[in-house]
């Protein structure tokens, strides 16, 4: 923080002399690409910042995986009950076994019904979708846009509410002063109008068809 | 000391119903499975079931199955036999005996007093 | 269902005889077989069990032999608590089967 208060103690700087710019400068002023925003976080605390992430969703599967291997195990302890073979002999095991295949029978019966039950479901549920469809007329899907995403809605989103109590990132991070930025005088014209235009879907679109 | 006591017989008529206890001590219950086997008035000893140390498991002769029901409370260690439908070829002493086996040989190794059932009109 | 059968409903023994009682199986039981003793006044206990095996408790005066579908109880020397009924039972299929019984009766 001794930096922070440093910079504060410096006189400004004074401001260099507009410079001046010809017309036809601005269009390439436009479309050429920018100097880059100088990044808040360096290479390397992106790549912790994304490792830290990774590992936390590795964590969350792994929990998943367990709960389920539990409610797996939980559901077939209540359907399957331990063999007790205590005093039970040779007849009695025929037996259980002739008894335990008769039940998986009637259990793949019951699944084979229900699996023809749900294909018809799915059939239905498919003609009906369809009938939707011809119904509306032609649906068009909109366009998905590419969408970036702060470390802070990743963690937000993978860790829902448990992401300000588990780990404030950005609290860990080292602040990075902004540096300022050379202010140009700039004419006052429809050049900025251009700018703005250009930037976009359109101006791309435009930079190539010319 | 093995023991186990049959309780619950009596006369009924055909169709009636009738469900026996044998109350078992001197040995751990819950480790065994348990069979109520039945004496003939001509002698005849019949097997009617089988039920396994932690009653998820029951055997039946054909001539009982769907009529007589075997289960067991491992806390009271009590075996019980429910007897519905019951005809007069029902007529027995009802025996309660303990399971034992050894190398896939199953045997009734411990045999209570027997509990008299008759079914007549 | 396997039919158990005795080559005799009663037998007449002295005291201090040899006594041996056979029993059939309708089919092979591969060892799979248990004699009973039951008492007059009711009371049935076990004697031998998987073909040969002596039961706890039991005088050493009984044995077992047998294999397949043939089978026996021997009791040497005859005693007077020893008359009985005697059964022998199969433990190889379900349903699980007795024999009629062999009454064993002093001379």
């Known amino acids: 923080m001794a930096d922070g208060s440093s910079d504060a103690a410096r006189e400004p700087r004074p401001a260099p002399a507009p410079i001046r710019r010809r017309s036809s400068n601005y269009r390439a002023y436009a479309t050429e690409p920018h100097a880059k925003k100088k990044s808040k976080i360096s290479a390397s605390r992106k790549l912790q910042l994304k490792t830290l992430l990774l590992q936390i969703a590795k964590q969350e599967l792994e929990r998943e995986a367990e709960e389920r291997r539990g409610e797996k195990g939980r559901a077939l302890s209540t359907r399957c009950q331990p063999l007790e073979l205590a005093g039970l002999g040779f007849a009695e095991l025929q037996d259980l076994c002739r008894q335990l295949h008769a039940r998986v029978d009637k259990v793949d019966e019951e699944r084979y019904d229900i699996e023809a039950k749900v294909t018809k479901n799915i059939t239905e549920i498919a003609d009906l979708t369809q009938k939707i469809f011809d119904l509306r007329g032609k649906f068009k899907r909109p366009t998905l846009r590419r969408v970036r995403i702060s470390a802070d809605a990743m963690m937000q989103a993978l860790l829902g509410a448990r992401a300000k109590e588990s780990l404030d990132l950005r609290a860990h991070l080292k602040q990075v002063k902004k540096e300022d930025t050379e202010k140009e005088n700039r004419e006052v014209g429809d050049w900025r109008k251009n700018i703005d235009a250009l930037s976009g879907m359109e101006g791309r679109k435009k930079k190539f068809e010319s | 000391e093995v023991q186990m006591v049959e309780s619950g017989g009596g006369l009924l008529k055909p169709g009636g119903s009738l469900k026996l206890s044998c109350a078992a001590s001197?040995?751990?219950?819950?480790?065994?499975?348990m069979s109520w086997v039945r004496q003939t008035p001509e002698k005849r000893l019949e097997w009617v079931a089988t039920?396994?140390?932690?009653?998820?498991?029951?055997f039946y002769p054909d001539s009982v199955k769907g009529r007589f029901t075997i289960s067991r409370d491992n806390a009271k260690n009590t075996l019980y036999l429910q007897m519905l439908s019951l005809r007069s070829e029902d007529t027995a002493m009802y025996y309660c005996?303990?399971?034992?086996?050894?190398?896939?040989?199953?045997?009734?190794?411990?045999w209570g007093q027997g509990s008299s059932v008759t079914v007549s009109s | 269902d396997i039919q158990m059968t005795q080559t005799s409903s009663s037998l007449s023994a002295s005291l201090g005889d040899r006594v041996t009682i056979s029993c059939r199986a309708s089919?092979?039981?591969?060892?799979?077989l248990n004699w009973y003793q039951q008492k007059p006044d009711g009371t049935i206990k076990l004697l031998i069990y998987?073909?040969?095996r002596l039961h706890s408790g039991v005088s050493s005066r009984f044995s077992g032999s047998g294999s397949g579908t043939d089978y026996s109880l021997t009791i040497s020397n005859l005693e007077q608590e020893d008359i009985a009924t005697y059964f022998c039972?199969?433990?190889?299929?379900?349903?699980?089967t007795f024999d009629t019984g062999t009454k064993l009766e002093l001379k």
């Open positions: 005996a303990r399971r034992d086996n050894y190398f896939g040989s199953s045997f009734m190794d411990y």
């Open positions: 039920i396994s140390s932690g009653g998820s498991y029951s």
């Open positions: 998987y073909t040969s």
């Open positions: 039972q199969q433990g190889h299929t379900i349903p699980l």
């Open positions: 001197g040995f751990t219950y819950s480790n065994y499975a």
């Open positions: 089919q092979e039981i591969t060892n799979y």
